[in-house]
């Protein structure tokens, strides 16, 4: 019951076509002309009720004003039911209906897939009045059809609150296959199978898929779209594409590169940002990641010293940021530093090694035998000590720092004094009488201040008391400093 028009280059009989009751044509205008033209459309039969004229959606009009006779039921005339054409061609189709002149203000609207077509569409309605009826032809034209024009078109006419609907006209725009899913670039593990997907649609269907790997056809026999290609594994980079074929021709997808994951390249440009006595801050530029994200990095540190055992310290760190502070190093030492990073495949080679040095450290021991006593004038506290036995790494002694804390009822005050490295004694003025003075001494190098000695306390009496007895740090093993007044 649906007739069909199909675009084709060769001559054809009017209706046979490739499908029963179909029409193949290159014409862009497929008109069901009004009866006055002398063309009588063929009588259509309902597919559901063979042998009975098919009238589609009809309006049964009321009796005429004279009340004598019924008018024939109103219905759109049959037209071509299916138009098949190529993309970018022009098409024109129509609906026609004969309406008794008793009806006024008849308007025809066009609908596509259930939605009214409004605005910028090329719809023209022509009226051919006669004595009793007016033939109305509503034409719809589309220039340079696209796939989006595919669909079912109908005419609607309203008369006396009755809606008359035409048979649908199916527009099928055919063209080259159109990809709905193309293969995507991937990074894969060597010799491990993976899948690629390709999907394309017509019309016309079917769409057949061929896969191409590095210019060689993978499947000489086509697969119907959609197609999933299982690649059995690669040992080196490859480029894949898929070809989609239908009766109109072929479309080739974008080519996608499949990379093989590998260990990363070694980092480059390892550089020193800051050195202290016991730490070095380094940065590096990561190498190529081997098509697999970096997981972490390893900083390798070797002491450059003929006497060292050549062992390597390894510090693991995150791959980002590309920076690491190496700690727990010896002061005033030379180190060779390299960096390696890893991804899921494995570790890179180590970067070129660079040399770095730590600075002088602070002393690691406090001055020894600290002694404190009040001198005769009671205005000074005399402090004496012995130079600590510092290691070479601590650098040269530049002096001492003396901390003296004065405590009396509810008051506490700390003061600091610096003295030169040649001294092993110092005098400080009494700050408060009737108070306790607590003294600690630390050695100082360019690397910093060492640990303070254990505190030594001395009581400073009120004016008039005399006491020459010293206070001193205890001998090793004693629990607390002894205070002698």
């Amino acid at each position: 019951a649906i007739t069909e028009a199909r675009e084709e280059a060769k001559p054809y009989p009017l209706f046979p076509g490739p499908l029963p009751g179909s029409l193949q044509t290159d014409h862009t205008s497929l008109l069901s002309l009004p009866h006055t033209s002398g063309y009588q459309p063929a009588l259509m039969f309902s597919p559901t009720q063979p042998g009975r004229p098919y009238t589609g959606n009809v309006a049964i009009p009321r009796v005429t004003s004279a009340g004598s006779k019924l008018l024939p039921p109103l219905a759109f005339k049959h037209t071509v039911g299916h138009i098949i054409l190529s993309e970018h061609k022009d098409v024109k189709f129509n609906c026609s209906i004969s309406v008794p002149n008793i009806y006024q203000d008849t308007t025809i609207s066009w609908w596509k897939d259930g939605k009214e077509l409004l605005g910028a569409h090329h719809a023209i309605t022509q009226f051919y009045p006669d004595d009793e009826v007016t033939a109305i032809i509503a034409s719809f034209s589309i220039t340079s059809v696209q796939r989006s024009d595919n669909g079912s078109y109908i005419c609607k006419m309203k008369i006396n609150n009755e809606e008359i609907v035409s048979d649908p006209i199916y527009i099928e725009v055919q063209g080259l296959p159109h990809f709905t899913k193309q293969p995507e670039s991937m990074n894969v593990t060597r010799n491990t199978a993976f899948n690629l997907t390709c999907q394309a649609v017509g019309p016309p269907e079917p769409v057949n898929i061929f896969w191409v790997q590095n210019s060689s056809r993978v499947n000489e026999q086509p697969e119907k779209s959609p197609s999933v290609l299982t690649v059995p594994g690669l040992t080196e980079m490859a480029v894949f594409s898929c070809e989609a074929h239908n009766d109109k021709g072929l479309t080739v997808s974008k080519g996608v590169q499949i990379n093989i994951k590998a260990i990363p390249s070694p980092p480059t440009e390892v550089s020193i940002h800051n050195s202290t006595a016991h730490s070095i801050l380094i940065s590096w530029v990561p190498g190529f990641d081997g098509y697999s994200p970096f997981r972490n990095c390893s900083v390798q540190v070797k002491e450059v010293d003929p006497l060292s055992n050549g062992s390597v310290m390894i510090f693991n760190t995150s791959a980002s940021p590309h920076m690491y502070q190496i700690k727990q190093l010896q002061a005033l030492a030379n180190y060779s530093i390299g960096v390696s990073c890893m991804n899921e495949i494995g570790w890179s080679a180590v970067s070129p090694w660079i040399l770095a040095s730590t600075t002088e450290g602070a002393p690691s021991v406090a001055p020894l035998n600290v002694t404190v006593f009040l001198n005769e004038s009671r205005d000074n506290v005399d402090i004496r000590w012995m130079k600590p036995l510092t290691k070479r790494q601590a650098g040269e002694l530049v002096g001492y720092r003396i901390s003296h804390v004065w405590q009396s009822a509810g008051i506490s005050k700390e003061l600091l004094e610096e003295v030169g490295q040649n001294n092993s004694r110092a005098q400080i003025s009494v700050q408060v009488h009737n108070a306790t003075c607590t003294v600690r001494i630390a050695a100082v190098t360019k690397g910093g201040v060492g640990p303070f000695s254990d505190p030594v306390k001395i009581f400073i009496p009120a004016h008039g008391w005399v006491d020459h007895a010293p206070s001193s740090t205890p001998a090793p093993g004693n629990a607390d400093p002894v205070l002698i007044i």
């Epitope: 010799n191 896969w211 590095n214 060689s216 993978v218 499947n219 000489e220 086509p222 059995p232 594994g233």
Partner: antibody, heavy 118, light 106 residues
Framework: QVQLVQSGSELKKPGASVKVSCKAS????????MSWVRQAPGQGLEWMGW????????SYTDDFKARFVFSLDTSVSTAYLQISSLKAEDTAVYYC???????????WGQGTLVTVSS | DIQLTQSPSFLSASVGDRVTITCRAS?????MHWYQQKPGKAPKLLIY???NLAQGVPSRFSGSGSGTEFTLTIFSLQPEDFATYYC?????????FGQGTKLEIK
């Protein structure tokens, strides 16, 4: 279990023709191509070409373009190899083999010995 | 056409041995497939796409290689492994086979 069953041995005179059949079972016949491979007595394997079981289009390698014809009867899932104007040097075992992606011949017929002798 | 050269052409080995067969291509190919053929029988797919074991093939068989050089290794030969082995290339039409390697019991 995929099976390719070939017709029996043939003894032919020079100049005659022979048609070898290969019946496939347990898979969709039109999904995979069918290849033909020749093995002369005591020799290695020679790929003769293949036939697209979907379209019926055959492809022949250069050495097998002249007197060899691949054909199909998809209704009975069978591929055929016809050799015309037989020569003594056509004496060989002819194998059909299912042809999958990447040119893999994953299942083989048992082979058909064609002997050409006067 | 791409020529495939297998070496050695003949190989004598004992049960339990490990043997390697090499297949060299006259130009680079995408994949190499390997087949085993026993006397009076059809070839049987052994390894496809260079390194993938075909269904039912024991894991003592292994394939590797890329470009123009490919190898088939059999670890710990079994009595049923004595046969002729063929390589076959994919990557350039027409597909071609190597001349075969006959593996015999020593």
């Amino acid at each position: 279990q995929v099976q390719l069953v070939q017709s029996g041995s043939e003894l032919k005179k020079p100049g005659a023709s022979v048609k070898v059949s290969c019946k496939a079972s347990s898979y969709t016949f039109t999904t995979y191509g069918m290849s033909w491979v020749r093995q002369a007595p005591g020799q290695g394997l020679e790929w003769m070409g293949w036939i697209n079981t979907y379209s019926g289009v055959p492809s022949y390698t250069d050495d097998f373009k002249a007197r060899f014809v691949f054909s199909l009867d998809t209704s009975v899932s069978t591929a055929y190899l016809q050799i015309s104007s037989l020569k003594a040097e056509d004496t060989a075992v002819y194998y059909c083999a299912r042809y999958t992606n990447y040119g893999v011949f994953d299942y083989w017929g048992q082979g058909t010995l064609v002997t050409v002798s006067s | 056409d791409i020529q495939l050269t297998q070496s050695p052409s003949f190989l004598s080995a004992s049960v339990g041995d490990r043997v390697t067969i090499t297949c060299r291509a006259s130009s680079s190919v995408g994949y190499m497939h390997w087949y085993q053929q026993k006397p009076g029988k059809a070839p049987k797919l052994l390894i496809y796409a260079t390194s993938n074991l075909a269904q039912g093939v024991p894991s003592r068989f292994s394939g590797s290689g890329s470009g123009t050089e490919f190898t088939l290794t059999i670890f710990s030969l079994q009595p049923e492994d004595f046969a002729t082995y063929y390589c076959q290339q994919w990557g350039s039409l027409p597909f071609t086979f190597g001349q075969g390697t006959k593996l015999e019991i020593k």
